[in-house]
């Protein structure tokens, strides 16, 4: 296993899920592999079966408990092992010590809704899902709005440098269909990364009032 052709990357959602991806060039697609998690100061351990996601990569979710339960803390270290079946025995392919709160990727924000819409502006709110209470207010958000004739990649990013679960979009065009997405990231963690984007919220601005006849 000591070569540059394999990669093992995991993230913690801050509550009760560790998601892992294992990639190995030249590995057989039908190889049976799993991830085993052993925390250094907990009585439980957990296993998940790696399932293929592409030609040379596998993924699985370590479900540590109920979705909103706080299963790990900032002082925990989890030893993660990739094991693959070779005949009747399991072969260890990789061993990684993993500090959960240095490797955070939260769930995508949920419950997006239009609070108020006008001709040129729209107020939208959302909620964070399965996020640890440890963060208190130490979160940031990025948002983007899809305008007609553009792609998501072209949409400018709006950054909210605090825990603010709403936004007021301005300078919109009247009677126009838009879509909106948001993602979240804790401020702590060496390898912490952005959550996936939320499901898009579609909304339409109100038409401009008709001018009086002259």
């Amino acid at each position: 296993a000591v070569n540059g052709t394999s990669q093992f990357t995991c993230f913690y959602n801050s509550r009760a899920n560790i998601s892992c991806v294992w990639s190995q060039d030249g590995a057989l697609q039908d190889t049976s592999c799993q991830v085993h998690a052993w925390p250094d100061r907990r009585r439980w351990n957990q296993t998940c079966e790696l399932l293929p996601v592409s030609q040379a990569s596998w993924a699985c979710n370590l479900i540590l408990g109920a979705p909103d339960s706080q299963k790990l803390t900032t002082v925990d270290i989890v030893t993660l092992r990739v094991l693959c079946r070779e005949g009747v025995r399991w072969r260890v392919m990789a061993i990684q010590d993993f500090k959960p709160f240095e490797n955070l990727r939260l769930m995508a924000p949920i419950s997006l809704q239009v609070v108020h819409v006008e001709t040129h502006r729209c107020n939208i709110s959302w909620e964070i899902s399965q996020a640890s209470h440890y963060f208190e207010r130490h979160l940031e958000f990025e948002a983007r709005t899809l305008s007609p004739g553009h792609t998501w990649e072209e949409a400018p990013l709006l950054t909210l440098k605090q825990k603010q679960e709403w936004i007021c979009l301005e300078t919109l065009t009247p009677d126009t269909q838009y879509e909106f997405q948001v993602r979240v990231k804790p401020l702590q963690g060496e390898f912490t990364t952005w959550s996936p984007w939320s499901q898009p919220l579609a909304f339409r601005t109100k038409p401009a009032a008709l001018g009086k006849d002259t």
Epitope: N3, G4, S6, F8, Q96, D97, F98, K99, E190
Partner: nanobody, 127 residues
Framework: QVQLQESGGGLVQAGGSLRLSCAAS????????MGWFRQAPGKEREFVAA????????MYAVSTEGRFTCSRDNDKNTVYLLMNSLKPKDTAVYYC????????????????????WGQGTQVTVSS
């Protein structure tokens, strides 16, 4: 750039423990990923463990069988290797190494990835 000095090696009976230390001086320790390698007589240098700049991820050689723990203290400019349940096959010179390039802690690095090396400390495990 940093200079590295290992300590903590010695003679230990099989089943015993040792903690190796690697002290860094002369640079910004937290900007380096750190690794441990070992070389037994007549054998090639072998990867043992590597940890990222902040210690958020640490990869271990499968041969360590979960008996070793690598950690770092960026305030003390030191990286450690705690070795438990030692076996005669663990007998080797243990080297500390620093990597100036970015290391994600998601793969097994090669010795050529490391730029700076200590002088090594001898570990002998008797049966």
């Amino acid at each position: 750039q940093v200079q590295l000095q290992e300590s903590g090696g010695g003679l230990v009976q099989a089943g015993g423990s040792l903690r190796l230390s690697c002290a860094a001086s002369g640079g910004t320790f937290s900007s380096y990923a750190m690794g441990w390698f070992r070389q037994a007589p007549g054998k090639e240098r072998e990867f043992v463990a590597a940890t990222t700049r902040g210690g958020g991820r640490t990869m271990y050689a499968v041969s360590t069988e979960g008996r070793f723990t690598c950690s770092r203290d960026n305030d003390k400019n030191t990286v450690y290797l705690l070795m438990n349940s030692l076996k005669p096959k663990d007998t080797a010179v243990y080297y500390c190494a620093a990597m100036t390039s970015y290391y994600s802690g998601t793969y097994y690095p090669d010795s050529s990835d490391f730029d700076i090396w200590g002088q090594g400390t001898q570990v002998t495990v008797s049966s």
